[in-house]
């Protein structure tokens, strides 16, 4: 799968929550960032993530929400110079400081699911999705397309701002 173009086609600043309305939050600790899944009260500030959308070419036999051999991939950045990365070896989702061009581990295929929810499939390990495990984000293997609606890999985006890159 190759990404067409170096610049994102669009960007959204959104808060990320799980299917059952827990918030994905980020905390700086000892010069590294931790990712949490928390129950927040309505008046507690939700953390924001910048989602950068890229168009990618992919072989016709691959699944995804693309049309005409194109599909959407995203990178997720909660703070400047830090992006979510898939650590396929450890089955973990981590925040790492990176410079552009970003490594493939920072890209996720975006699947639009039912009820305004989305899921994020690892670019480097197809069939593996960002999911929730024990109040943390983890990489979760999904065996078949029927299991794509499993709740622990579904997320909701609450859009707060919309950037267009010209």
């Amino acid at each position: 799968m190759s990404i067409t173009g170096i610049s994102p086609i669009t960007e959204y600043l959104a808060s990320l929550s799980t299917y059952n309305d827990q918030s994905i939050t980020f905390a700086l600790e000892d010069e590294s960032y931790e990712i949490y899944v928390e129950d927040l009260k309505k008046d507690e500030k939700k953390d924001k993530v910048l989602l950068s959308y890229y168009e990618s070419q992919h072989p016709s036999n691959e699944s995804g929400d693309g049309v005409d051999g194109k599909m959407l991939m995203v990178t997720l950045s909660p703070t400047k110079d830090f992006w979510l990365h898939a650590n396929n070896k450890e089955h973990s989702v981590e925040l790492h400081k990176s410079e552009k061009p970003l490594p493939d581990q920072a890209f996720f295929v975006l699947h639009n699911m039912h009820s305004n929810s989305v899921s994020f499939e690892s670019k480097t390990d197809p069939g593996v999705f960002i999911g929730v495990k024990d109040n943390h984000l983890a990489l979760i293997k999904v065996d078949s397309s029927e299991n794509l609606s499993t709740e622990n890999i579904l997320f909701k985006l609450s859009e707060t701002h919309h950037h267009h890159h010209h």
């Epitope: 939050t25 905390a27 600790e29 949490y36 928390e38 129950d39 927040l40 009260k41 309505k42 008046d43 507690e44 500030k45 109040n135």
Partner: antibody
């Protein structure tokens, strides 16, 4: 489920010291400020100490400043209140409470069950 | 410090009755007000925050309203478990301060 369990209350003589503890579970302790609140028997509630989520800053009213010290151990999900130079007017039930998340939201969403401190000779 | 004055201090009431507790602040607190219930065994529970937002799991018979310096807590139809002490708290300005409490008791 969020739980706060207070302990360490006892009967002590005036001028002595006592340390209270509060063990937290069911939430990410290090993301929240924490607070101690007390209630003199038959009276209202009084805020007595707060600590930021990292433990870097602490706040007290004049009534306990210089005598009481709030601290926390984020690795153990535990809040402490060190009380020195105790006076009879410190006799109260002491509650720990979860305060605001970093600096957003509203305070004291969850409370411990309280622990009774009696200062008497 | 901001002073909070609750009234009445005691509120005798009957099951099924609608009751309202008032909390007046010495200066404007911009809706930064919570309401707490304390049971006879000492257990404290937050009912409402941000003046009118009900905590999840709190029955809808409880409601909060107000602005500026005048706030209130209402219980639309009293149930037996509602006989307790109620406190307001302002968190607009440090130090956070509580009202002196209102005891809702059986008439």
């Amino acid at each position: 489920e969020v739980q706060l369990v207070d302990s360490g209350g006892d009967q002590v003589q005036p001028g002595r010291s006592l340390k209270l503890s509060c063990v937290a579970s069911g939430f990410i302790f290090k993301n929240y400020w924490m607070t101690w609140i007390r209630q003199v028997p038959g009276k209202g509630l009084e805020w007595i100490a707060s600590i930021t989520n990292s433990g870097g800053n602490t706040y007290y009213p004049d009534s306990v400043k210089g005598r009481f010290t709030i601290s926390r151990d984020n690795a153990k999900d535990t809040l402490y209140l060190q009380m020195n130079s105790l006076r009879s007017e410190d006799t109260a039930t002491y509650y720990c409470a979860r305060d605001r998340r970093y600096n957003s939201g509203s305070p004291f969403a969850y409370w411990g069950q309280g622990t009774l401190v009696t200062v008497s000779s | 410090d901001i002073q909070l004055t609750q009234s009445p201090s005691t509120l005798p009431a009957s099951l099924g009755e609608r009751v309202t507790i008032s909390c007046r602040t010495s200066q404007s607190i911009n809706n930064n007000l919570c309401w707490y219930q304390q049971k006879p065994d000492g257990t404290v529970k937050r009912l409402i925050y941000s003046t009118s937002t009900l905590e999840s799991g709190v029955p809808s018979r409880f409601s909060g309203s107000g602005s500026g310096t005048d706030y209130s807590l209402s219980i639309s139809s009293l149930e037996s478990q509602d006989f307790a002490m109620y406190y307001c708290l302002q968190y607009a300005t440090y130090p956070w301060t509580f009202g002196q409490g209102t005891k809702v008791e059986i008439k």
